[in-house]
Interface confidence: low
């Protein structure tokens, strides 16, 4: 069935962007790397260079969730984090500019970003109960909980 | 309407610390992060650095570290000052001021309190 | 830490005039520039940000443009109520530095 975000006519208009070039560290201490030009996977790095660097947009919902919501977007990049359905990989969706406004089945788009001491979780808009996670010799992807890992560590440059 | 509506003014020997509040109203605390700013008497303004009111997380400017720190509490919707180690030099007034919501220029602050006024003097 | 040039330091006109104030950064910095307006014993106010974007419900009056290093700020029409200070801040980089500021006297 749709999910119930799809339902509503929950509107999301941008706000500012909050973070830039932050590395996504899994409870295993990967990083999220890019595989290919569409898929993010995780691996343990010695140079963090080679990690993939992100912004993070922050997103009003026009209900006043309290939950913060946010785009996830390569620096210096077009290319966005798109959520397709559980256990299949992220996208990386390319689109000219950051999306003023984000409704119905454009919220795979869209993360809920929790906070838990260091531990940081993004859920799928699209999908309230699935997660951005890691999982072994597997792409970056949309999951439920264990055996993929679903909390982050956000490492930044400290201007 | 948006408020931000700051603490009394303070008058400090020089060693002692001063904490300065900021309570917000009008608008999703969190949503926004909050600048500190200050003015020396006839002098421009310095920015002190600033906090993200989502996480907690601060950042300093480089002459303020290690003498200033941040603090929220977001059940009343105010965030808070502290500098420490006061010196003449640091008399001033202190503005807390609000991230402009609007997407381009993350930096710039669209509403302000009315300033704190903070005399060290022995 | 960027440093930013605001000039003149203070200026004279009348009202009506067309009135412009001008700030050069030491580096460049992607039209990241805001100016605000401060009347004294008060808080300063957003008037523009990101170079040339007018802050809603300031007065059209007041406009800014620029790119790379240079900026401009204009009051079309001098207002007896626009004198005040005139300061310009970059946020492009830490710690978002301010110019030393522009004050504004009716003749």
């Known amino acids: 069935s749709a999910p119930f975000s799809f339902l509503s006519n929950v509107k999301y208009n941008f706000m500012r962007i909050i973070k830039y070039e932050f590395i996504l560290n899994d409870a295993l201490n990967q990083s999220i790397i890019r595989a290919n030009d569409q898929y993010l996977t995780a691996a343990a790095l010695h140079n963090l260079d080679e990690a993939v660097k992100f912004d993070m947009g922050a997103y009003k919902s026009s209900k006043d969730d309290a939950k913060i919501t946010v785009i996830l977007r390569i620096s210096k990049t077009q290319l966005y984090v798109t959520a397709q359905d559980e256990d299949q990989p992220v996208l990386l969706k390319e689109m000219p500019e950051i999306p003023k406004t984000i409704t119905g089945s454009e919220t795979n788009l869209l993360f809920f970003w929790e906070t838990h001491g260091t531990k940081n979780y993004f859920t799928s808009v699209a999908h309230p109960n699935l997660f951005i996670a890691t999982k072994q010799d597997y792409w970056v992807c949309l999951a439920g909980g264990p055996p993929s890992i679903t909390d982050f560590q956000i490492l930044e440059n400290q201007a | 309407e948006i408020q931000l509506v700051q603490s009394g003014a303070e008058v400090k020997k020089p060693g002692a610390s001063v904490k300065v509040s900021c309570k917000a109203s009008?608008?999703?605390?969190?949503?926004?992060?909050m600048n500190w700013v200050r003015q020396a008497p006839g002098q421009g303004l310095e920015r002190m650095g600033w906090?993200?009111?989502?996480?907690?997380?601060?950042r300093y400017a480089d002459d303020f570290k290690g003498r200033v720190t941040f603090t929220l509490d977001t059940s009343t919707s105010t965030a808070y000052m502290e500098l420490s180690s006061l010196r003449s030099e640091d008399t001033a007034v202190y503005y807390c001021?609000?991230?402009?919501?609007?997407?381009?220029?993350?930096?710039?602050?669209?509403?302000w309190g009315q300033g704190t006024t903070v005399t060290v003097s022995s | 830490d960027i440093q930013m040039t605001q000039s003149p330091s203070s200026l004279s006109a009348s009202v009506g005039d067309r009135v412009t104030i001008t700030c050069r950064a030491s580096?460049?910095?992607?039209?990241?520039l805001n100016w605000y307006q401060q009347k004294p014993g008060k808080a300063p106010k957003l008037l523009i940000y990101?170079?040339?974007r007018l802050k809603p419900g300031v007065p059209s009056r007041f406009s800014g443009s620029g790119s790379g290093t240079d900026y401009t700020f204009t009051i079309s029409s001098l207002q007896p109520e626009d004198i005040a200070t005139y300061f310009c801040?970059?946020?492009?980089?830490?710690?978002?530095?301010f110019g030393q500021g522009t004050k504004l006297e009716i003749k």
């Open positions: 906090i993200n009111t989502y996480t907690g997380e601060s």
């Open positions: 580096q460049d910095i992607s039209n990241r």
């Open positions: 009008g608008y999703t605390f969190k949503y926004y992060g």
């Open positions: 801040q970059q946020g492009n980089t830490p710690p978002y530095t």
């Open positions: 001021a609000r991230d402009i919501y609007y997407f381009g220029s993350d930096y710039a602050m669209d509403y």
């Open positions: 990101y170079a040339s």
